[in-house]
């Protein structure tokens, strides 16, 4: 979503989106100087007024965060920063339009593993996003995408993976080794909007087996 | 005990409309996905649409789009799909089916939705 | 939309024999398949969710496997309880569509 550079002031204006946060960012031209300051206005699409975002006007850094005034994910928003340097003329650039449903960014998912003697369980924890229903709860990633599911992998040695996959919450892997290590990764899909996340990680080793000590 | 009671099925002319309704309980109908299922005579099972309780975001099978509106009322737990312009090809039994722990593993007994003159 | 190829679309079993019913997807669905079983008259029971894991209180007759595009459903040994239609269901992405069904009659 990055407009063409055609000014030394101000380039790279684009919507950065993770788990429904957007972010809108820009660069300074090689022209732009520690004096140069940036105003931001957005709009929905298909309507012609533009709206000044209050807190970022005439500001240093080079980003905002235009979640709230984008958060409806079945619109469209346009947003521009005008960039004004001392004794310069101001420039002004728009992003391409943006759908924080179609292009954010899924994270990771947040996730649980609990070893036990000869299984290990992965809990997955419902993500929630800055999306709001209309009666003013906060959305999680699930209740968003239909076709969300969740893929487990359970590394077992170089060789040899398991794998689970599915819409549920809770998951086990079983009939593992005790007192071994493992290398769990568990990564989110939504296959109609081709998203993927970037795995969550976790290390564990199963329990001893305590049981033939003591018999 | 997830039960899940449907209801407005009947007799309706090509053209016509029905809004057929579910009524649900056992489990936090205000946070799931609730389905609408049919199943003509003697024939195999589709899905028709889809609505999150909570986001409110719909997904409808080709056929149907246009023409049938999922929607619930959250305060009365109650699913509900309006039917218009229905087709002799509507015919069917209709069930409502939710995802509960990311299994579709409950139906209600179903209601006959029969479009003929 | 992802088209379910279930086959064969019946089958005469005898008490006690082994059945085994296909299911093709149209495309790769890692193993986002149910399988149902259903009498006339009722709504659909799930037995295997995940392609391969049986649902809580289905007997340990009942057997998924598969992924990808190819999927079974065994059952071994019928029960007079078994006889029914049963339908593959792919999980993956809407519109969720089944297959077109197999019915176990009595040989």
């Known amino acids: 979503h990055t407009t063409v550079d055609t000014s030394g002031l101000l380039q790279h204006v684009k919507f950065q989106s993770s788990n429904f946060e957007n972010i809108l960012t820009w660069d300074g031209g090689p022209a732009s100087t520690s004096d140069t300051v940036y105003s931001v206005e957005y709009k929905k699409y298909g309507e012609r007024k533009w709206l000044a975002k209050a807190g970022c006007q005439r500001i240093t850094q080079k980003f905002c965060n235009l979640t709230m005034e984008t958060r409806n994910h079945t619109e469209f928003y346009y947003a521009k920063v005008t960039a004004v340097s001392a004794g310069g003329p101001p420039v002004t650039k728009m992003t391409d339009r943006f759908s924080s449903l179609q292009h954010t960014t899924i994270k990771p998912p947040d996730v649980t593993c609990i070893p036990k003697v000869r299984s290990i369980q992965m809990l997955v924890h419902p993500t929630l996003t800055p999306v709001l229903s209309e009666d003013g709860h906060q959305l999680t990633l699930e209740e968003i995408f239909h076709d969300l599911f969740y893929r487990l992998e359970l590394h077992v040695n170089h060789t040899y993976q398991m794998h689970l996959e599915g819409k549920q919450r809770e998951y086990e892997f079983l009939g593992l080794t005790p007192d071994t290590e493992f290398l769990g990764s568990i990564t989110i899909l939504t296959p109609i909007l081709s998203k993927e996340s970037a795995p969550y990680v976790c290390r564990v080793k199963t329990l001893p087996d305590r049981t033939w000590a003591y018999s | 005990e997830v039960q899940l009671v449907e209801s407005g099925g009947g007799l309706v002319q090509p053209g016509g409309s029905l809004r057929l309704s579910c009524a649900a309980s056992?489990?936090?109908?205000?946070?799931?996905?609730m389905y609408w299922v049919r199943q003509a005579p003697g024939k195999g099972l589709e899905f028709v649409s889809v609505?999150?309780?909570?986001?409110?975001?719909?997904h409808y099978v080709e056929s149907v789009k246009g023409r049938f509106t999922i929607s619930t009322d959250n305060a009365k737990n109650t699913l509900f799909l309006q039917m218009n312009s229905l087709k002799s090809e509507d015919t069917a039994v209709y069930y409502c089916?939710?995802?509960?722990?990311?299994?579709?593993?409950?139906w209600g007994q179903g209601t006959q939705v029969t479009v003929s003159s | 939309d992802i088209q379910m190829t279930q086959s064969p679309s019946s089958m005469s079993a005898s008490l006690g024999d082994s059945v085994t019913i296909s299911c093709q997807a149209s495309?790769?669905?890692?193993?986002?398949l149910f399988w149902y079983q259903q009498n006339a008259g009722q709504p659909p029971k799930l037995l295997i969710y995940?392609?391969?894991r049986l649902q809580t209180g289905v007997p340990s007759r009942f057997s998924g496997s598969g992924s990808g595009t190819t999927f079974t459903l065994t059952i071994s040994g019928v029960e007079t309880g078994d006889l029914a239609t049963y339908y593959c269901?792919?999980?993956?992405?809407?519109?969720?569509?089944f297959g077109q069904g197999t019915k176990v009659e009595l040989k």
């Open positions: 089916a939710t995802r509960i722990q990311g299994l579709i593993d409950y």
């Open positions: 056992g489990f936090t109908f205000s946070s799931s996905w």
């Open positions: 609505i999150n309780t909570r986001s409110g975001i719909t």
């Open positions: 495309e790769n669905i890692g193993t986002q």
């Open positions: 995940g392609a391969s």
């Open positions: 269901l792919q999980d993956y992405s809407w519109p969720l569509t």
